[in-house]
C-alpha cells in the first residue's frame, strides 16, 4: 500500500503519500477553529508509470495504453485513497461544540 | 457533473472528461478479444483551480492551501468518478464467451 | 529479445505449500496471455492454466483446480504459480510459457523450467 | 477432454532422410487449433508449427505441417542432425489445452 508506513520510509519518485501539515489560520485562513491549530493532512503526488498501483481496470488499461503509445497525454494520475477523519474544537458563540470532519487526512494514494 | 454531456459540448481546459477510443489489437497488443474490436475508453484531464469538482473536504482543502500558497505542489489531481462496465466477447479455444468487465469505461471526473 | 525466467522450485513435503515466479523481459508482458505447463520426470507435457493481462481472468486443469493459483504483477512483468495441498504427483518441471495471443493458443516462448519435488 | 495420440511412438531414421509423424485427436479441431513442439534432452519444448501449417519465426522451411479436423501431420523434409529429439503436438480447439505423449525421433 502507497501508504505512510512504505512512502515515509522510502525515497519514491512515483506515486506516494507525501507528508504535509497544514496551519489553519496561516494556510487555510481559517480562524474559527479552536483546537487543533493544525493538523497532518498529507498529499499524494508522484508519476504513475506503467501499472504502478493501479486501482481500476481503467486505470490499468490506460497505464498499458501509454506504454505502447508514449506520446499519449491520456494517463493515470495519483490521487487519495483511504481518508480520515479529523475532530475539530470550535464555538458557536461561548458554547464549545466538537466536530468530526470527515475525509480530511489521506492515508494512502493510488494511481487512478 | 464532469460528464460527455458537459464536457463534450464545451472547450475545457480544466478537469473534465475527455474522448479516448481504444483499439484493442493496435492500442493494448490484446489479440484475445474478438469483440468489439476497440471502445470509447474515455479519461479524465484538466487542470483542477481553486474548488472546481472538488470530490472530498482533504481535496477542498488541498484546493484553498493551493490558492493561499501557490508555490506548493500539493495540488488536487483530475480522475475518473464514475465508471462503467464494458461487455466484451472472446473464444476459448473455438468455444464463444462472453464476459463483462468491470470499470473499463470512464462516464465522468473529478477533482480528487 | 523476449525471456521468461522462473524461480521457486523446491523440494516439499506433501500438503505443503510453494510459490513459483516466472519474470517476463524484452515484450510488454500486459499484452499476452500467461500459461503454466508442467512435465513429470520422462513424461510428456500437461497445461496446468492460464491467466489474461489486466482482467485477470483464470482457468485451470481440473488436476489442479482448487489448489492451484496462477497470478500476475503487471507492474513488475511477474507471473506467479501458488500451489497448495501438494500432491506426489505434483512433482515435475514447471514451465511459464506465453501464448501466441488468444486465450488457447500455441505458446511461442518457454522458460527454463522449475523442478517441483513433492516427497515426505 | 480432447485426446491426442501421436505415432509411432519412435521413429529411427538417417540424417538426410525424410521424417513423418503423425497426431490423431478424438474429436475435430478444425483446421487450425495445433501446435507442433520440438524438446530436447534438458531444455524447454520450442514451437515449430502453430495454425496446423504455419511455421514459428526462426523455424527452418524443412520443418511443415499440415492436416486439418483430427489427422495432422509435421513432415521434415531432410533431417538434419539437430533434428533428432521428443516432438510433441498440441491442441488448444478446447479446454483444457491438451498435448499428445510425444514422438522420439532417433538417429537410425
Known amino acids: 500500500a502507497l501508504d505512510a508506513a512504505y512512502c515515509f520510509r522510502n525515497v519514491q519518485d512515483n506515486c506516494c503519500l507525501r507528508p504535509l501539515y497544514i496551519d489553519f489560520k496561516r494556510d487555510l485562513g481559517w480562524k474559527w477553529i479552536h483546537e487543533p491549530k493544525g493538523y497532518n493532512a498529507n498529499f499524494c503526488a508522484g508519476a504513475c508509470p506503467y501499472l504502478w498501483s493501479s486501482d481500476t481496470q481503467h486505470s490499468r488499461v490506460l497505464s498499458l495504453y501509454n506504454t505502447i503509445n508514449p506520446e499519449a497525454s491520456a494517463s493515470p494520475c495519483c490521487v487519495s485513497q483511504d481518508l480520515e477523519p479529523l475532530t475539530i474544537l470550535y464555538y458557536i458563540g461561548k458554547t464549545p461544540k466538537i466536530e468530526q470532519l470527515s475525509n480530511m487526512i489521506v492515508k494512502s494514494c493510488k494511481c487512478s | 457533473a464532469l460528464d460527455a454531456a458537459y464536457c463534450f459540448r464545451n472547450v475545457q481546459d480544466n478537469c473534465c472528461l475527455r474522448p479516448l477510443y481504444i483499439d484493442f489489437k493496435r492500442d493494448l497488443g490484446w489479440k484475445w478479444i474478438h469483440e468489439p474490436k476497440g471502445y470509447n475508453a474515455n479519461f479524465c484531464a484538466g487542470a483542477c483551480p481553486y474548488l472546481w469538482s472538488s470530490d472530498t473536504q482533504h481535496s477542498r482543502v488541498l484546493s484553498l492551501y493551493n490558492t493561499i500558497n501557490p508555490e506548493a505542489s500539493a495540488s488536487p489531481c483530475c480522475v475518473s468518478q464514475d465508471l462503467e462496465p464494458l461487455t466484451i466477447l472472446y473464444y476459448i479455444g473455438k468455444t464463444p464467451k462472453i464476459e463483462q468487465l468491470s470499470n473499463m469505461i470512464v462516464k465522468s471526473c473529478k477533482c480528487s | 529479445e523476449v525471456q521468461l525466467v522462473e524461480s521457486g522450485g523446491d523440494l516439499v513435503k506433501p500438503a505443503g505449500s510453494l510459490r513459483l515466479s516466472c519474470v517476463a523481459s524484452?515484450?510488454?508482458?500486459?499484452?499476452?496471455?500467461m500459461s503454466w505447463v508442467r512435465q513429470a520426470p520422462g513424461k510428456g507435457l500437461q497445461w496446468v492454466g492460464y491467466?489474461?493481462?489486466?482482467?485477470?481472468?483464470?482457468n485451470y486443469a481440473d488436476a489442479v483446480k482448487g489448489r492451484f493459483t496462477i497470478s500476475r504483477d503487471n507492474a513488475k512483468n511477474t507471473l506467479y504459480l501458488q500451489m497448495n495441498s501438494l500432491r506426489v504427483e505434483d512433482t515435475a518441471v514447471y514451465y511459464c510459457?506465453?501464448?501466441?495471443?488468444?486465450?488457447?493458443?500455441?505458446?511461442?516462448?518457454w522458460g527454463q523450467g522449475t523442478l517441483v519435488t513433492v516427497s515426505s | 477432454e480432447t485426446v491426442l495420440t501421436q505415432s509411432p511412438g519412435t521413429l529411427s531414421l538417417s540424417p538426410g532422410e525424410r521424417a513423418t509423424l503423425s497426431c490423431r485427436a478424438s474429436?475435430?479441431?478444425?483446421?487450425?487449433?495445433l501446435a507442433w513442439y520440438q524438446q530436447k534432452p534438458g531444455q524447454a519444448p520450442r514451437l515449430l508449427i502453430y495454425?496446423?501449417?504455419s511455421r514459428a519465426p526462426g523455424i527452418p522451411d524443412r520443418f511443415s505441417g499440415s492436416g486439418s479436423g483430427t489427422d495432422f501431420t509435421l513432415t521434415i523434409s531432410r533431417l538434419e542432425p539437430e533434428d533428432f529429439a521428443v516432438y510433441y503436438c498440441?491442441?488448444?480447439?478446447?479446454?483444457?489445452?491438451?498435448f499428445g505423449q510425444g514422438t522420439r525421433l532417433e538417429i537410425k
Open positions: 510459457t506465453r501464448t501466441l495471443g488468444l486465450v488457447l493458443d500455441a505458446m511461442d516462448y
Open positions: 524484452g515484450y510488454t508482458f500486459s499484452s499476452n496471455v
Open positions: 491467466v489474461i493481462p489486466i482482467v485477470d481472468i483464470a
Open positions: 474429436q475435430s479441431l478444425g483446421s487450425s487449433y
Open positions: 495454425g496446423a501449417s
Open positions: 498440441q491442441q488448444y480447439a478446447d479446454s483444457p489445452i491438451t
